[in-house]
Amino acid sequence: EEELQVIQPEKSVSVAAGDSATLNCTVSSLIPVGPIQWFRGAGPGRELIYNLKEGHFPRVTAVSDPTKRNNMDFSIRISNITPADAGTYYCVKFRKGSPDVELKSGAGTELSVRAKPSAPVVSGPAVRATAEHTVSFTCESHGFSPRDITLKWFKNGNELSDVQTNVDPAGKSVSYSIRSTARVLLTRRDVHSQVICEVAHVTLQGDPLRGTANLSEAIRVPPFLEVTQQSMRADNQVNVTCQVTKFYPQRLQLTWLENGNVSRTEMASALPENKDGTYNWTSWLLVNVSAHRDDVKLTCQVEHDGQPAVNKSFSVKVSA
């Protein structure tokens, strides 16, 4: 009699994550009597994937009715494939007995799974830095297969070169992750700047995935201070202004000191934004000259974004 053949016609099958995979298997003879089982992997550590007789395999269905008389098609369909399903699947014929005895295995079908990378997530520094300092941004994307992937960084459309990128794991795996760090030199003009991490992969339909971060979250632009005196008014009052310019973020507290004593404290709020994203603020202090015998030392003290206070002083001359 002709020797039983277990035929797995495809050496390899490739599917996209989320799709179904059909693994074909036919036998050349109904004899000897005995079940067919599907395994992933070979040898003692192999994993049972499908057994018609018993077990619960919610994602696996038989393509044709295996209970039908004279059925010789033992193909299976695995639904909702994930990268973890990758591997070599074997269709194995057993001879009925107590226990059943393995008789013949098919040549195996390698299941390869292609999976898209997750949307890149870009994170910036935990604390703000000032212009002329370098900060690091990190971009991460996970779950893709195959391993080949390209990642590029851009700042305002210009590609960044100070970049370090790793794809893990280094060896063979069902899926991979990428992590990249870009170092960005901040300038005072960067409040409206944006960094973009762009990930390209074979599974993406031509358009890279992008993750973005705004440099406004990472930058602190310290203010310039200027104290000036307006001309004396008829009522012997002098208007002194403290101009606080080009600062970011808006969080700012201004204190006026007269001869070292606190005169008034103000908090910046609802300021109009400059074109470059920074803010300006002007505070006025009226000084009654006739109430003073000596010159008055006025100090405009600015505490910006929790940083140490910056002072600018001005002396108002009191004529004898």
Epitope: P146, T150, A200, V202, L204, D207
Partner: antibody, heavy 116, light 109 residues
């Protein structure tokens, strides 16, 4: 799922010509599409692709000679200033469902002859 | 740009013969290689993608192998309908560009 090219004809050198690829059975917003050409008796040559969102990418040799664009059901290839070397059958094709590294559906092609 | 070198440029074979066509990339393309069959006046037809995966509906006598720079298309037993020109096509994941080999014409001996 079907692709059909149209617009191929005899054209004089320097006269712009637009070829169209009309698709049915799938959405152009879901797949990368490509243009290829084959000069008489020669091999296949890649011209460019357009991404699912409509961004075109070209082979390095194109240098502005072609422009790829698309609408909801057609993809166009504009030959900006054809020369006699552009005489060929032009094919459009769709990438496979698993990725952009291969093309599994092709149109029958449309013949462009550039001659004075 | 990547260059794809196909060999031989043509071959003569008989029905039932085993036919092997090779394709070499000028730099590694990992497994991003497809094989197409084209008959005169017709569009190319996909046979193999990702170097070794048989496209749906393609007879199992066609098989592909290789990775990196060296690839092979094998027809295990040539049939009358297999007389055609075969092209390899690469995709480079960094440049995201495509390149074809110059083609191999399989003729009847």
């Amino acid at each position: 799922v079907q692709l059909v090219e149209s617009g191929g004809r005899l054209v004089q050198p320097g006269t712009p010509l637009t070829l169209s690829c009309t698709v049915s059975g799938f959405s152009l917003s879901s797949y990368v599409m490509g243009w290829f050409r084959q000069a008489p008796g020669k091999g296949l040559e890649y011209i460019g692709i357009i991404s699912s969102s409509g961004s075109p990418y070209y082979a390095s040799w194109v240098n502005g000679r072609f422009t790829i664009s698309k609408t909801s059901t057609t993809m166009d290839l504009k030959m900006n200033s054809p020369t006699t070397e552009d005489t060929a059958t032009y094919f459009c094709a769709r990438v496979g469902p698993l990725g952009v590294d291969y093309f599994n559906i092709w149109g029958p092609g449309t013949l462009v002859t550039v001659s004075s | 740009d990547i260059q794809m070198t196909q060999s031989p440029s043509s071959l003569s074979a008989s029905v039932g013969d085993r036919v092997t066509i090779t394709c070499r990339a000028s730099q590694s393309i990992n497994s991003y290689l497809a094989w197409y069959q084209q008959k005169p006046g017709k569009a190319p037809k996909l046979l193999i993608y990702s170097a070794s995966f048989l496209y749906s509906g393609v007879p199992s006598r066609f098989s592909g192998s290789g990775s990196g720079t060296d690839f092979t298309l094998t027809i295990s037993s040539l049939q009358p309908e297999d007389f055609a020109t075969y092209y390899c096509q690469s995709w480079h994941y960094i440049s995201r560009s495509y390149t074809f080999g110059q083609g191999t014409k399989v003729e009847i001996k």
